[in-house]
């Protein structure tokens, strides 16, 4: 999916008001300095691409993020503010239902959500001019 035509300001507002709170809850008890950010993004569409990938694609050691509250709110925000996004997700959602696993917060998941934190942080920054 190409995130270029999303309403970034609306997604930013959704992140600040709700998604961030769920990330805070998920990460509670974890030091912000515990994990280094290894995933970065260069502009808002790129940030959303990386956010979608980390939130909804199961990875080794962390298969369960898509069922977390922050993931469901992320999905809702993208569905509302990115034209045509929901249609592209129907097949992915059906595949995910078949793979559904018990929710377990592993260290790998905490690390992955820490990466998400960094991506959202970068998404939030207004445009910075390169020197």
């Amino acid at each position: 999916y190409d995130f270029t035509n999303c309403d970034f300001e609306k997604i930013k507002a959704a992140y600040l008001s709700t998604i961030s709170k769920d990330l805070i809850t998920y990460m509670s008890g974890t030091k912000s300095t515990e994990f280094n950010n290894t995933v970065s993004c260069s502009n808002r569409p790129h940030c959303l691409t990386e956010i979608q990938s980390l939130t909804f694609n199961p990875t080794a050691g962390c298969a369960s993020l898509a069922k977390e509250m922050f993931a469901m709110k992320t999905k809702a925000a993208l569905a509302i503010w990115c034209p045509g996004y929901s249609e592209t997700q129907i097949n992915a959602t059906q595949a995910m239902k078949k793979r559904r696993k018990r929710k377990v917060t592993t260290n790998k998941c905490l690390e992955q959500v820490s990466q998400l934190q960094g991506l959202w942080r970068r998404f939030n920054r207004p445009l910075l001019k390169q020197q």
């Epitope: 008001s17 961030s20 990330l23 920054r125 020197q131």
Partner: antibody
Framework: QVQLQQSGAELVRPGASVKLSCKAS????????MHWVKQTLVHGLEWVGT????????AYTQKFQGKATLTADVSSSTAYVELRSLTSEDSAVYYC????????????WGQGTTLSVSS | DIVMTQSQKFMSTSEGDRVSITCKAS??????VAWYQQKPGQSPKTLIF???NRHTGVPDRFTGSGSGTDFTLTISNVQSEDLADYFC?????????FGGGTKLEIK
Amino acid sequence: QVQLQQSGAELVRPGASVKLSCKASGYTFTDYAMHWVKQTLVHGLEWVGTIDPETGGTAYTQKFQGKATLTADVSSSTAYVELRSLTSEDSAVYYCTREGSYGGYVDYWGQGTTLSVSS
Amino acid sequence: DIVMTQSQKFMSTSEGDRVSITCKASQNVHTAVAWYQQKPGQSPKTLIFLASNRHTGVPDRFTGSGSGTDFTLTISNVQSEDLADYFCLQLWNYPYTFGGGTKLEIK
């Protein structure tokens, strides 16, 4: 733990330039933007600008465009603000402050550097 | 630029009281507001971020609320160590802008 250590007080002549530093420790320097804030009795707290240490990208308040230049040295985890063509109006305490973990706020502050511009 | 107005420059309260400090934005800043405490001779300290989240180590007598244009910092059971200046800051849009500050005095 996160610490921002700023350089010492400066007394400089009008018309000169000065470069203030802010050494970060306790976190990965390139993961967080760094902001600079000016404080005076007259104007209170004013946001000067921000820098993304990873890319070198910057943004400034219009008032400080041309007055302040923000840079970052990743190798030493140090952020800098250079102030040029100094006047008494630039006399203030300057703070560096780190972008918050979740974005949309700043969390940790340096101890501040007092700049006095006087002939 | 977005203007952040703290209409009360000074507020006087007694130990044990509850006090509310307000901040009004000139346009919608959603929940991108933080509150800072500054004691004499010290650098500012983060109290509340994203309108209502307490920063690490901040006592739970400090509470933030609001969204859009109206924000409130409430201190319940005021202590003598709460004597300080309190500032709001919007981080929705560059340039980020601070409120003028409210000085809390303890009777």
